[in-house]
């Protein structure tokens, strides 16, 4: 995939932006007490463009799309208490914790901590 | 797909934008004389966001991506002359003529009008 675009010569005053915003995320599970955790969400305006096609095609289709998505994230365990469920008194949920975000090719998605 | 987002409460000063820019397009084919035609390309900054995943998933994955792409286009025939190709003296190329553009869901196929 081509590298993300941050500036366009046609619009020198415009810049792509993609931020990791702090959020309070509610982690829930049926029959269990929900927990609020601090997390981050990605939000932004990345560049996209589409140049007309020809048929038969003379060149590669000139379509570009960047999207604001996690550039680094990791998975953590969040344990929820489930009162009244004697056989399952607690449930362990896995939550993706977003570290930071960037404009990336739309078909692509976020990176996690090392293997 | 959810409707495209034009404004975000979190960023009241930011607006999605997607323009149809006039371009001169070179239509070519191997062994034929290229032609320059007037066309339009789509270019812009649409909104995208990504909210962290959980496992097992409590809700639908909260990922949204809009991209600047043709909202209306039609295919036109452009005939190219091919001197020295006696058996194929001309070639008809189909060219997508973009009428206007808008922010639309990233996976969406652009809509075309018939020839």
């Amino acid at each position: 995939a081509p590298p993300p675009i941050n500036k366009l010569a046609l619009f020198p005053d415009k810049s792509a932006w993609c931020e990791a915003k702090n959020i309070t995320q509610i982690v829930g599970h049926s029959g269990c007490e929900a927990k609020s955790i601090q997390n981050r969400a990605c939000l932004g305006q990345c560049f996209s463009y589409s140049v007309p096609n020809t048929f038969p095609q003379s060149t590669e289709s000139l379509v570009h799309c960047d999207s604001c998505m996690p550039a680094q994230s990791m998975w953590e365990i969040v344990t929820l208490e489930c009162p009244g469920h004697e056989e399952v008194p607690r449930v362990d949920k896995l939550v993706e914790k977003i570290v930071h975000c960037s404009c990336q090719a739309c078909g692509k998605e976020p990176s996690h901590e090392g293997l | 797909a959810p409707p495209p987002i034009n404004k975000l409460a979190l960023f009241p000063d930011k607006s999605a934008w997607c323009e149809a820019k006039n371009i001169t397009q070179i239509v070519g084919h191997s062994g034929c004389e290229a032609k320059s035609i007037q066309n339009r390309a789509c270019l812009g900054q649409c909104f995208s966001y990504s909210v962290p995943n959980t496992f097992p998933q409590s809700t639908e994955s909260l990922v949204h991506c809009d991209s600047c792409m043709p909202a209306q286009s039609m295919w036109e025939i452009v005939t190219l002359e091919c001197p020295g190709h006696e058996e194929v003296p001309r070639v008809d190329k189909l060219v997508e003529k973009i009428v206007h553009c808008s922010c639309q869901a990233c996976g969406k196929e652009p809509s075309h009008e018939g020839l």
Partner: antibody, heavy 118, light 112 residues
């Protein structure tokens, strides 16, 4: 809907290589690692390795070190597993399976049968 | 590598009766965070494996509540409270604490 769709069955000669693909859809491709697990006819499951689709980093089981290569193409949300210097004992069904980080293999591909025979 | 040992190898069961499968690891699967990195999978005849239990005792989405996982450290158990005909197949435990991931040899559950 999460889907992992693998390439079709292959018949290979000893010494050859095979490249199996696994196309992911219905989720954020790089939010999850991808594992490869194989199963010889009538046998149990054997873990081969893991790839992080985001950065492309890999970790392989010692047994396959030097013979296996896992790669990914983020533009098509596809991971690949190439196994070289094939021998008859590599005849197996090869599965891709995704995992959230260090955690469980929650979705599996349908499997690809690779037959190594002279 | 962590060696995973399952027993029994084969388990003939009567529908409606309980069943139990044991899995032992050569090293403790209890992480310093207090969680056991042990998963259970079921491979039904002619199908890909499917996740049943993760982190020792958590049922995956859509898994009936007749399945439960327990244990800690090196000894783990998968229990089926009332076996149904659709539960036949090979059950595998897998440790997720270390690379390489390793599977138990499998336990074949079949109807008597």
């Amino acid at each position: 809907e999460v889907q992992l769709v693998q390439s079709g069955a292959e018949v290979k000669k000893p010494g050859a290589s095979v490249k199996v693909s696994c196309k992911a859809s219905g989720y954020t491709f790089t939010s999850y690692y991808m594992h490869w697990v194989r199963q010889a006819p009538g046998q149990g499951l054997e873990w081969m390795g893991i790839i992080n689709p985001s950065g492309g980093s890999t970790s392989y089981a010692q047994k396959f070190q030097g013979r296996v290569t896992m790669t990914r193409d983020t533009s098509t949300s596809t991971v690949y597993m190439e196994l070289s210097s094939l021998r008859s004992e590599d005849t197996a069904v090869y599965y891709c399976a995704r995992a959230p980080g260090k955690f469980p293999l929650d979705y599996w591909g349908q499997g690809t049968l690779v037959t190594v025979s002279s | 590598d962590v060696v995973m040992t399952q027993s029994p190898l084969s388990l003939p069961v009567t529908p409606g009766e309980p069943a139990s499968i044991s899995c032992r690891s050569s090293q403790s699967l209890l992480h310093s965070n207090g969680y056991n990195y042990l998963d259970w999978y079921l491979q039904k005849p002619g199908q890909s494996p499917q996740l049943l239990i993760y982190l020792g005792s958590n049922r995956a989405s859509g898994v009936p509540d007749r399945f439960s996982g327990s244990g800690s450290g090196t000894d783990f158990t998968l229990k089926i409270s009332r076996v149904e005909a659709e539960d036949v197949g090979v059950y595998y435990c897998m440790q997720a604490l270390q690379t390489p991931r390793t599977f138990g040899g499998g336990t074949k559950v079949e109807i008597k």
